[in-house]
């Protein structure tokens, strides 16, 4: 049943080319190169990809040809190291080229930049895009892959192929429509939002594997797959977890060809065995490969089997608990996690992992005690506060969201998080708090039974964004502590942070609060970001400001922007009224 055990191939590059086909091969090599060398021009990458593809074709023709027996890391690394401007563009990353495999690839991986210094992608006019699409469809789509991959160096490569397919379909349909813009723009917005979400979700998977190890990822996968496939046997779930771990390890490690190939094999296996996995897979399994894999990854939870026996019988009441645990600790804990998760689609994965950790800690202590059973008899009682904490937090925050609406809820979180970790850069605080605030619209609409898995697992993804951005330029010991101590306790760790009393308020700088007429032409979203940036700066200057004080200043600020954007001489209004606003704000906050 090992889906991924293959015969040894004389030429790995020929094997993957044949398995994936030329189109997917080229797309995946382009993604791989753009994720490693994020600053290189598009044309340079295309040239490298064409060279690799031509070489692969010679190996398909004759697997014994020169260099065809080399590993993909060796071939790709050698190709990347031919880039002439490596030292000037990437600095110390050029030192990677002096290393041998596998150290060279590890070196490239370590230099992936989660926040590369690249210009924001500006969307051209629809007619301009449609002309470019019709003039050279292949280049247009490659450019999409390149631009996404270099900005999201951990984007799940086979899923990016699925996005590119939808991107192409949108242009194919809409560039022929009567109202091109009305057809295309909503589709592009949807792809952009879904793409950002997909990137962030994958980033958490890679962080889980790279920072906390395979065991942590497997535990996450057991919990999630057991919720999704509660009728599947433990053996089946274990097999899927092993295969899924291999797929994500490969993609997170830059082995994109292997990853895409193995993901296709896994989708095939799941569809061939759907009877023993889930009743919800039928529609997914009728789709073409890329859609099929995406559909399986997003499939709804199957119904729980009726009349599942009590968990306590095996994991508390049995006389064999310590014997079973001692015989195979991880298998026993895996069974516990499987049994608990399949019964609780209403819990977040991170909560299930906290429960499993509590159970493990209890067994470690109790199985060494004089009377183990007496010691662990009440272990399930220890779960109650762990379950209630996220339930209460979600209830309170959904009430706040419903009261305030998304924008003001984001502002409440901006203030909360800036007070917790004021050392973090303003753009990061704005980005992360805005995303944290989106949990309201995303999850609060759900019934109670779906709120926690939606909210807490989403918050794990967003807080991981904070962690990876902070890791690049660490400025706060508190952030480092919450990010590194425990993957599953990150959210409770951040929730528990109070105002940082050690923080020395930032010096007041009038320039930070000087605004110009250009704010009037911004989209509503961009205008919100400007205001939220000012709010963060305000809190950094006056961390002890009350909610009421901050609300008053922000209301004044909103009125000021609205007034000046209606004025005949906008720039003069911003200059004059801006000075007054700054003075009034300083007075109101006692700056």
């Amino acid at each position: 049943r090992g889906v991924f055990r293959r015969d040894a191939h004389k030429s790995e590059v020929a094997h993957r080319f044949k398995d994936l086909g030329e189109e997917n091969f080229k797309a995946l090599v382009l993604i791989a190169f753009a994720q490693y060398l994020q600053q290189c021009p598009f044309e340079d990458h295309v040239k490298l990809v064409n060279e690799v593809t031509e070489f692969a074709k010679t190996c398909v023709a004759d697997e014994s040809a020169e260099n065809c027996d080399k590993s993909l890391h060796t071939l790709f690394g050698d190709k990347l190291c031919t880039v002439a401007t490596l030292r000037e563009t990437y600095g110390e990353m050029a030192d990677c080229c002096a290393k041998q495999e596998p150290e060279r690839n590890e070196c490239f991986l370590q230099h992936k930049d989660d926040n590369p210094n690249l210009p924001r992608l500006v969307r051209p006019e629809v007619d301009v895009m449609c002309t470019a699409f019709h003039d050279n469809e292949e280049t247009f789509l490659k450019k999409y892959l390149y631009e996404i991959a270099r900005r999201h160096p951990y984007f799940y490569a086979p899923e990016l192929l699925f996005f590119a397919k939808r991107y192409k379909a949108a242009f194919t349909e809409c560039c022929q429509a009567a109202d091109k813009a009305a057809c295309l723009l909503p589709k592009l917005d949807e792809l952009r939002d879904e793409g950002k979400a997909s990137s962030a979700k994958q980033r958490l998977k890679c962080a889980s594997l790279q920072k906390f190890g395979e065991r942590a990822f497997k535990a996450w996968a057991v919990a999630r797959l057991s919720q999704r496939f509660p009728k599947a046997e433990f053996a089946e779930v274990s097999k899927l977890v092993t295969d899924l771990t291999k797929v994500h390890t490969e993609c997170c490690h830059g082995d994109l060809l292997e990853c895409a190939d193995d993901r296709a094999d896994l989708a095939k296996y799941i569809c061939e065995n759907q009877d023993s996995i889930s009743s919800k897979l039928k529609e997914c399994c009728e789709k073409p490969l890329l859609e099929k894999s995406h559909c399986i990854a997003e499939v709804e939870n199957d119904e729980m089997p009726a009349d599942l026996p009590s968990l306590a019988a095996d994991f508390v009441e049995s006389k064999d608990v310590c014997k079973n645990y001692a015989e195979a600790k991880d298998v026993f804990l895996g069974m516990f996690l499987y049994e608990y998760a399949r019964r609780h689609p209403d819990y977040s994965v991170v909560l299930l992992l906290r429960l499993a950790k509590t159970y493990e800690t209890t067994l470690e202590k109790c199985c060494a005690a004089a009377d183990p059973h007496e010691c662990y008899a009440k272990v399930f009682d220890e779960f109650k506060p762990l379950v209630e904490e996220p339930q209460n937090l979600i209830k309170q925050n959904c009430e706040l969201f419903e009261q305030l609406g998304e924008y003001k809820f984001q502002n409440a979180l901006l203030v909360r998080y800036t007070k917790k970790v004021p050392q973090v850069s303003t753009p990061t605080l704005v980005e992360v708090s805005r995303n944290l605030g989106k949990v309201g619209s995303k999850c609060c609409k759900h019934p109670e039974a779906k709120r926690m898995p939606c909210a807490e697992d989403y918050l794990s993804v967003v807080l991981n964004q904070l962690c990876v951005l902070h890791e690049k330029t660490p400025v706060s010991d508190r952030v480092t502590k919450c990010c590194t101590e425990s993957l599953v306790n990150r959210r409770p760790c951040f929730s528990a942070l109070e105002v940082d009393e050690t923080y020395v308020p930032k010096e007041f700088n009038a320039e930070t609060f000087t605004f110009h007429a250009d704010i009037c032409t911004l989209s509503e979203k961009e205008r919100q970001i400007k205001k939220q940036t000012a709010l963060v700066e305000l809190v950094k200057h006056k961390p002890k400001a009350t909610k009421e004080q901050l609300k008053a200043v922000m209301d004044d600020f909103a009125a000021f922007v609205e007034k000046c954007c209606k004025a005949d001489d906008k720039e003069t209004c911003f200059a004059e009224e801006g000075k007054k606003l700054v003075a009034a704000s300083q007075a109101a906050l006692g700056l």
């Epitope: 599947a232 046997e233 433990f234 053996a235 023993s276 599942l308 968990l311 019988a313 095996d314 079973n324």
Partner: nanobody
Framework: EVQLVKSGGGLVQPGGSLRLSCAAS????????MSWVRQAPGKDVEWVSS????????TYADSVKGRFTISRDNAKSTLVLQMNNLKVEDTAVYYC????????????LGQGTQVTVSS
């Protein structure tokens, strides 16, 4: 290859007892819930009882509750159904099956063992 070899069926009078046994091979027995199902002549397959991987959790059809007991020995990869106070309506071919709650209908039930309750 998955194999489930049953033994212990036979003819018994109402009120009597029988012990069915099933020796499993070809898979990791302890990683599967196990079940007993039965099929009376001209009827659909009916679920009888299931047991969790570790053997502590058990469930029974209402019709056999209090009379039948399911158990397992993971060290020997063996599943047992102890049937007491048998009734005429328990007459059926009994199958042991890998899986729980629905999946056993899809499993290869293999050769069953005949249980006949008659005076």
């Amino acid at each position: 290859e998955v194999q489930l070899v049953k033994s212990g069926g036979g003819l018994v009078q109402p009120g009597g007892s029988l012990r069915l046994s099933c020796a499993a091979s070809g898979f990791t027995f302890s990683h599967y819930q196990m079940s007993w199902v039965r099929q009376a002549p001209g009827k659909d397959v009916e679920w009888v009882s299931s047991i969790s991987m570790l053997g502590g959790g058990t469930t029974y059809a209402d019709s056999v509750k209090g009379r039948f007991t399911i158990s397992r020995d993971n060290a020997k990869s063996t599943l047992v159904l102890q049937m007491n106070n048998l009734k005429v309506e328990d007459t059926a071919v009994y199958y042991c099956a890998r899986g729980f709650s629905g999946n056993y209908y899809r499993a290869d039930l293999g050769q069953g063992t005949q249980v006949t309750v008659s005076s």
